[in-house]
Amino acid sequence: SGTTNTVAAYNLTWKSTNFKTILEWEPKPVNQVYTVQISTKSGDWKSKCFYTTDTECDLTDEIVKDVKQTYLARVFSYPAGNVESTGSAGEPLYENSPEFTPYLETNLGQPTIQSFEQVGTKVNVTVEDERTLVRRNNTFLSLRDVFGKDLIYTLYYWKSSSSGKKTAKTNTNEFLIDVDKGENYCFSVQAVIPSRTVNRKSTDSPVECMGQEKGEFRE
């Protein structure tokens, strides 16, 4: 239903990485505009992205208020230049999004190896603790702050001179691994939330190798 010159939005899709969260939809508007509303299951609707011709809406500011809540959004379609117009049922045409729980569903962004330091036959590899847009007491929380021990990292490492790989896990942002003296190693890390059933793993970090800028060596 709805007015003859508006179509309902469709393919409503949440795109979320490290809690930066955007709702996308189709179609590209022709003689119509959109407004988005978001709410928690028990909360009131809040309007965002008023009368926009975009087909996306950044809802980060809303979902970071409580990342463990489940959110629902809806996209209203209005005729361009006549936003007061309503559908045949007396209200604007709209479409609901799938439910979205940020804590369980936001994608884990590609991690970055911050540094590695060799001391004898040990190497300490540190993963950058990425800042999110989740706030507490007016400060932005890191990924570790938000997920705590639910977040682990997997390290892959190998001698530059061979293809044989090893792996290690940590529930902090640091690895301490044994290496052969005099050998250069390469490293890549991956973020994992083992308790999840979807979006469990990030993509691998860029590979960092000893003998390059980020490292430090001490006898």
């Epitope: 790989k165 529930n171 059933t197 469990r200 793993k201």
Partner: antibody, heavy 117, light 107 residues
């Protein structure tokens, strides 16, 4: 529900190779790590190696390095283990297992490989 | 490589007994320790993950404790179906290593 279905028992000659498979259902293998574990008759469990199907990283126990290759075909949700230069002590049950990051939470039913001339 | 020392290698117990099995790692494994039950001719079954968390469908008489290098599996009140072999596994670092196993037999 989650299932790991392994290929059937194999009889192989010493010096040859064997390739066994593990077909996963009920989950996306790219979201997990997949491993192979060996158990000789009457003995304990021994980790052979593992694979991350999302990025094709494979890791092996040094005892098996050079003789074992673990691969994954994400299009068919199947993990493979190929073991070469077979000897009598490779006679064992081989299990595939899913690694959640916290544990090997699901296991296949096991594939018996018998190496005999 | 990390060595896992599991003890005892076998024990005899009666239904209703409290049973404790320990695993000691040769270095800190940061709680990447899991416990498995295996019955004859069957695949291992996950009991405890991340040192202390109970796997789905596992009775609450099973519990795990420990951190660092020392870990324990406890069966608070042994049931007839608990007679089996138990293994610990460290998966904090490759090569992953299992304990030698503990066979729990009927006294």
């Amino acid at each position: 529900q989650v299932q790991l279905l392994e290929s059937g028992a194999v009889l192989a000659r010493p010096g040859t190779s064997v390739k066994i498979s593990c077909k996963a259902s009920g989950f996306n293998i790219k979201d997990y790590y997949m491993h192979w574990v060996k158990q000789r008759p009457g003995q304990g469990l021994e980790w052979i190696g593992g694979n991350d199907p999302a990025n094709h990283h494979s890791m092996y126990d040094p005892k098996f390095q050079g003789r074992v290759t673990i691969t994954a075909d994400t299009s068919t949700s199947t993990v493979f283990m190929e073991l070469s230069s077979l000897r009598s002590e490779d006679t064992a049950v081989y299990y595939c297992a899913r690694d959640s990051g916290y544990a090997m939470d699901y296991w296949g039913q096991g594939t018996l490989v018998t190496v005999s001339s | 490589d990390i060595q896992m020392t599991q003890s005892p290698s076998s024990l005899s117990a009666s239904v209703g007994d409290r049973v404790t099995i320990t695993c000691k790692a040769s270095q800190d494994i940061k709680s990447f320790l899991s416990w498995y039950q295996q019955k004859p001719e069957k695949a291992p079954k996950s009991l405890i993950y991340y040192a202390t968390s109970l796997a789905d469908g596992v009775p609450s008489r099973f519990s795990g404790s420990g951190s660092g290098t020392d870990y324990t599996l406890t069966i608070s009140s042994l049931q007839p179906e608990d007679f089996a072999t138990y293994y610990c596994l460290q998966h904090g670092e490759s090569p992953y290593t299992f304990g030698g196993g503990t066979k729990v037999e009927i006294k």
